[in-house]
Interface confidence: low
């Protein structure tokens, strides 16, 4: 299948901006973001604007990915118990309306 | 750091600290206390965009930081000073890590001392 | 809010081991990162452990910071001893209400 120059060249750029430890599989598929690593640090629920939950068996390993309020997005492990507390967290948050 | 001084209970003072040598806008800022021969205290934070800001329960509704990206400099105005907010006050920098909140600079502190 | 519970002193003489411990009183103490604060007589905190257990730049690698899940805990831990190491020791966490907690401090004495 040929792929022409600026085609090659888009896909180039998108894959500059897929984060760390984030890959996305071939686009001829439905769009799915996997975890292929995961932080082995920590994150302040303070520094948390959301998270998702990657449950594909497209993708290798279940994970959360959180997005931080500046928009970076880090893969981290469902299994560890601070994922679990800051999921817990960011739930409540939403359930909550700010008055 | 500066402002510090001598005021009655029940007047306001405000301090300021005068940040350099780092991109002052790219850090959280906290004021952090310690009243003579006690612990340390955390007063509040700030965050580098100066949107978000906390405080301990016992100075909230009475002190307010703010901070001056175009002097680099943090401020924290006391109002309705009680005997018990005596102490040293420290500014500090946060880590600003993703990751947790901590300081890794320290002011030299400036003392006040709230007596009649 | 939790606590952090630290001994109000400890004492040791130079060029042995001491630990000092910092215990959460609710809550996980492997949930938030703990920090740990040098301040000699006279003068402003300094960092010497971030992070649970990493050392800033110029901190000499006697000084070790861990955390224990089962005693809800975390620990710095200062080996061969000196005279200068005595000064009052800060564990800092923090919590998800967006306040910071230190504990009551440590005065480490070297005999």
């Known amino acids: 299948m040929k792929v022409s120059a600026a085609l090659l060249c888009l896909l180039l750029i998108a894959a500059t901006f897929i984060p760390q430890g984030l890959a996305q599989p071939d686009a001829i598929n439905a769009p799915v973001t996997c975890c292929y690593n995961f932080t082995n640090r920590k994150i302040s629920v303070q520094r948390l604007a959301s998270y998702r939950r990657i449950t594909s068996s497209k993708c290798p390993k279940e994970a959360v990915i959180f997005k931080t309020i500046v928009a970076k997005e880090i893969c981290a492990d469902p299994k560890q118990k601070w994922v679990q507390d800051s999921m817990d967290h960011l739930d409540k948050q939403t359930q909550t309306p700010k008055t | 750091q500066s402002g510090g001084g001598v005021v009655q209970p029940g007047r306001s003072l405000r301090l300021s600290c005068a940040a350099s040598g780092f991109t002052f806008s790219s850090y959280g800022m906290h004021w952090v206390r310690q009243a003579p021969g006690k612990g340390l205290e955390w007063v509040a934070v700030?965050?580098?965009?100066?949107?978000?800001?906390y405080y301990a329960d016992s100075v909230k509704g009475r002190f307010t930081i703010s901070r001056d990206t175009s002097k680099n400099t943090l401020y924290l105005q006391m109002n309705s000073l009680r005997a018990e907010d005596t102490a040293v006050y420290y500014c500090a920098r946060d880590s600003s890590s993703y990751y947790y909140y901590g300081m890794d600079v320290w002011g030299q502190g400036t003392t006040v001392t709230v007596s009649s | 809010n939790f606590m952090l519970t630290q001994p109000h002193s400890v004492s040791e003489s130079p060029g042995k081991t001491v630990t000092i411990s910092c215990t959460r009183s609710s809550g996980s103490i492997a949930s938030n990162y703990v920090q740990w604060f040098q301040q000699r007589p006279g003068s402003s905190p300094t960092t010497v452990i971030y992070?649970?257990?990493?050392?800033p730049s110029g901190v000499p690698d006697r000084f070790c910071g861990s955390i224990d899940s089962s005693s809800n805990s975390a620990s710095l831990t200062i080996s061969g001893l000196r005279t200068e190491d005595e000064a009052d020791y800060y564990c800092q966490s923090y919590d998800s209400s967006n306040h910071v907690v230190f504990g009551g401090g440590t005065k480490l004495t070297v005999l």
């Open positions: 700030i965050w580098y965009d100066g949107n978000n800001k």
């Open positions: 992070e649970d257990d990493q050392r």
